[in-house]
């Protein structure tokens, strides 16, 4: 197993609709054809998997149907979008990239993107 550099933004603010997007870029040392991308969340001294997708270079990322993540790939960049976020989901979201094929296997872990989620204030009742 070999190490690989992964870059991602330090901070992202989710939209009022609970959607956050960021780019995960990896420095591929070779010509990988199969790549696995995993988004992890670190909070309260625990790391949990948010979503994961394996894709063939040049093809679209495919997350599970019930995943809160969507994404697109372009070269060594993956554009990730996480939806359905609430204030309680604020935390450090880490991009993990694995070059699965061909060998050798490479593993890269980003420094994490702190995603801040602010629940929208409910609209006040109006007489109009």
């Amino acid at each position: 197993c070999k190490a690989m550099h992964v870059a991602q933004p330090a901070v992202v603010l989710a939209s009022s609709r609970g959607i956050a997007s960021f780019v995960c870029e990896y420095a591929s040392p070779g010509k990988a054809t199969e790549v696995r991308v995993t988004v992890l969340r670190q909070a309260d001294s625990q790391v949990t998997e948010v979503c994961a997708a394996t894709y063939m270079m040049g093809n679209e990322l495919t997350f599970l149907d019930d995943s809160i993540c969507t994404g697109t790939s372009s070269g060594n960049q993956v554009n990730l979008t996480i939806q359905g976020l609430r204030a309680m989901d604020t935390g450090l979201y880490i991009c993990k990239v694995e070059l699965m094929y061909p060998p050798p296997y490479y593993l890269g872990i980003g420094n994490g993107t702190q995603i801040y989620v602010i629940d929208p204030e409910p609209c006040p009742d109006s007489d109009f």
Partner: nanobody, 126 residues
């Protein structure tokens, strides 16, 4: 809250083997840096081995190199210390320790640890 629980200690003859386990309750050890320390009677606590959060890096004290092997099984939420060719001087209480570092340090061992288990006694004697 995560707690660490050691097991696998006991009495073994010189030259024998033991495998210590460090299991987590109340959470997972995924990506945690885990260390094994030991303390013999009348001696200072010393770090024996550690494994990084990714499992890619392992370190060993000179006194156990080539005899001890640390590994992790995330599916079992457990870190192991395989101890071979045990000597009388390996007799001690062995402690499992852990810390979840920033992701930029997941490939490294921690310099200090937040969490400590209660320890398990290892006695090497004929």
């Amino acid at each position: 809250e995560v707690q660490l629980v050691e097991s696998g200690g006991g009495l073994v003859q010189p030259g024998g083997s033991l495998r210590l386990s460090c299991a987590a309750s109340g959470g997972t050890l995924d990506y945690w840096s885990i260390g094994w320390f030991r303390q013999a009677p009348g001696k200072e606590r010393e770090e024996v081995s550690c494994i990084s959060g990714t499992g890619l890096r392992t370190n060993y004290a000179d006194s156990v190199k080539g005899r001890f092997t640390i590994s992790r099984d995330n599916s079992k939420n457990t870190v192991y210390l395989q101890m071979n060719s045990l000597r009388a001087e390996d007799t001690a209480v062995y402690y499992c320790t852990g810390k979840l570092l920033h992701p930029s340090l997941w490939s490294a061992c921690a310099n200090e640890y937040d969490l400590w288990g209660q320890g398990t006694q290892v006695t090497v004697s004929s």
